[in-house]
Amino acid sequence: AITEAREEAKPYPLFPGPFPGSLQTDHTPLLSLPHASGYQPALMFSPTQPGRPHTGNVAIPQVTSVESKPLPPLAFKHTVGHIILSEHKGVKFNCSISVPNIYQDTTISWWKDGKELLGAHHAITQFYPDDEVTAIIASFSITSVQRSDNGSYICKMKINNEEIVSDPIYIEVQGLPHFTKQPESMNVTRNTAFNLTCQAVGPPEPVNIFWVQNSSRVNEQPEKSPSVLTVPGLTEMAVFSCEAHNDKGLTVSKGVQINIKAIPSPPTEVSIRNSTAHSILISWVPGFDGYSPFRNCSIQVKEADPLSNGSVMIFNTSALPHLYQIKQLQALANYSIGVSCMNEIGWSAVSPWILASTTEGAPSVAPLNVTVFLNESSDNVDIRWMKPPTKQQDGELVGYRISHVWQSAGISKELLEEVGQNGSRARISVQVHNATCTVRIAAVTRGGVGPFSDPVKIFIPAHGWVDYAPSSTPAPGNADPVLII
């Protein structure tokens, strides 16, 4: 049967009575050593009758005395079997054994839950020698017990390669409930059920759980640990905690906030990072996410021109990295830009609108209807064209660039001419006779040079030829016109 000793009990006697051989309470031990490294050498002296043996692991010595009497079996004496005490209290327990003095090499070690206790434990082994036996008392003390000290403690002694094991001493450290699982903060959908878990352990058991929501108990009846609370749904933020009760008192878990997912707040601080003729790079600071991660964002772009049709272009992008390059915009145009982001609940309102402008760009099309003809009287080539549509000029025209390439046998030379934006004709001097002149024209704005027109070729004959027809930009599909006069 287990002997229970509670913390308020009187100190346990080390033995049922004095040792045979008249060992008295004032009898000081011959040797008292602190327990270092788990093993303690025992010094043996003259034997007397050993104490009451236990039923555990017993060593039967094979050696006989001078009178050839067989020695009785060696065993640890019975001691208290179960010690119950509160956390942070001190405890001391011991093993005792009487060993015939003929054994010179004995060691006692302490074990807890099958593992040897080594090092800095408070273990002391005391030796009380008598004529034929030495009483050995191995004491183990813990000054302030913790839950981790719970367990089964035994002594082991080795004699002549035989192992003697004591009965276990069960240490049960009791205290307030200890949480092994506490509720976690969550973000939940409005009016949707969710679960919270709370688990606490003793000893002592049982541990009962009460749930608390916004300082009010959810259950007036205790629930055995572990407890799962199904919250039927919330319409507003709430704080939950759980109380764990046992015979020692109660422990309260951390309070956790349960937030209700909502649509996000609109983004703020939409700003222009960079503008080009056809794109605007914007950034924004996301608003509050409504307790639900952002999924994506929508950039809304409106032409700010009061004469525009007011249509809105929408560009969808990922929520990160709060940056987006809006493309396919017109050059030298004004736009209103707003940003909205969404989470699983829905879309935020649109951010405050900001105004942004694209810069001047190089024209996107070449001049049209390019015509070239030879004016032999002045030894010039006359070039005419139509300027590109205003929409596609992508800025204010500052002029044109004319490329004319002269090719004759084995010679090729390209010349560039810049002409002002007024007018749509130019005259260039003939550079080489008996050669082909290839002309291309590009419109120019402050944003750069636009694409060149398709090449128009004219043959410049040797001196003396009279009849010249113009050469012009071909109709589509006529790739390389050559006018030979």
Epitope: N208, V218, N219, E220, T230, G233, A238
Partner: antibody, heavy 118, light 105 residues
């Protein structure tokens, strides 16, 4: 299945005592609290109080302190409502109803009609 | 204690109609529960924790609300819905509303 079965109708004289029982079955009796609810003929519901079936501690609504007593016989999974010194106005139907979390009465007894008349 | 006021006291409807009854609390409550009581029977749990239907309650019933204002709605009334409906809170001391009697024409 879960059931709350109440004792039968009672006819009492003013000044007498009555004890109404509510026997629970189909669940662990000590897990759920037990409330008592009064309903006068043709009237609404009025909460009288409850008893903690785990600890046995009763709680009474303000209007039911004094002559009313809740008790338990846990081994029989039974809750009791005792009314002392009966008055004519105690004539009504009494319901037991169990609850756990969020104090929602998920099962009700069939009701016990008490008539107090001289 | 928290007083619950139900309106209307009597509600008449024809089968197929949508009806709503309300329950107002004298101060804010966390959850509202609703019970249905047919004449001569004990109350039955109908809606718990504001919006959750009790076992066996038809999906045409719904509950909503927060703070001090709660409601029970029947999307298409049927004759078997004729009963008295009580709201109930236990945020303070438990109280019941006076009931709304639903009559089917």
């Amino acid at each position: 299945q879960i059931q709350l079965v109440q004792s039968g109708p009672e006819l009492k004289k003013p000044g007498e005592t009555v004890k109404i029982s509510c026997k629970a079955s189909g669940y662990t009796f000590t897990t759920y609290g037990m409330s008592w609810v009064k309903q006068a003929p043709g009237k609404g519901l009025k909460w009288m109080g409850w008893i903690n079936t785990y600890s046995g501690v009763p709680t009474y609504a303000d209007d039911f302190k004094g002559r009313f007593a809740f008790s338990l016989e846990t081994s029989a999974s039974t809750a009791y409502l005792q009314i002392n010194t009966l008055k004519n106005e105690d004539t009504t139907t009494y319901f037991c109803a169990r609850f756990l979390r969020y104090y929602y009465f998920d099962y009700w007894g069939q009701g016990t009609t008490l008539t107090v008349s001289s | 204690q928290i007083v619950l006021s139900q309106s209307p006291v009597i509600l008449s409807a024809s089968p197929g109609e949508k009806v709503t009854m309300t329950c107002r609390a004298s101060s804010s409550v966390t959850y509202m529960h609703w019970y249905q009581q047919q004449p001569g029977s004990s109350p039955k749990p109908w809606i718990y924790a504001t919006s959750n239907l009790a076992s066996g309650v038809p999906a045409r019933f719904s509950g909503s609300g927060s703070g001090t204002s709660y409601s029970l709605t029947i999307s298409r009334v049927e004759t078997e819905d004729a009963a008295t409906y009580y709201c109930h809170q236990w945020s303070g001391n438990p109280t019941f509303g006076g009931g709304t009697k639903l009559e089917i024409n």
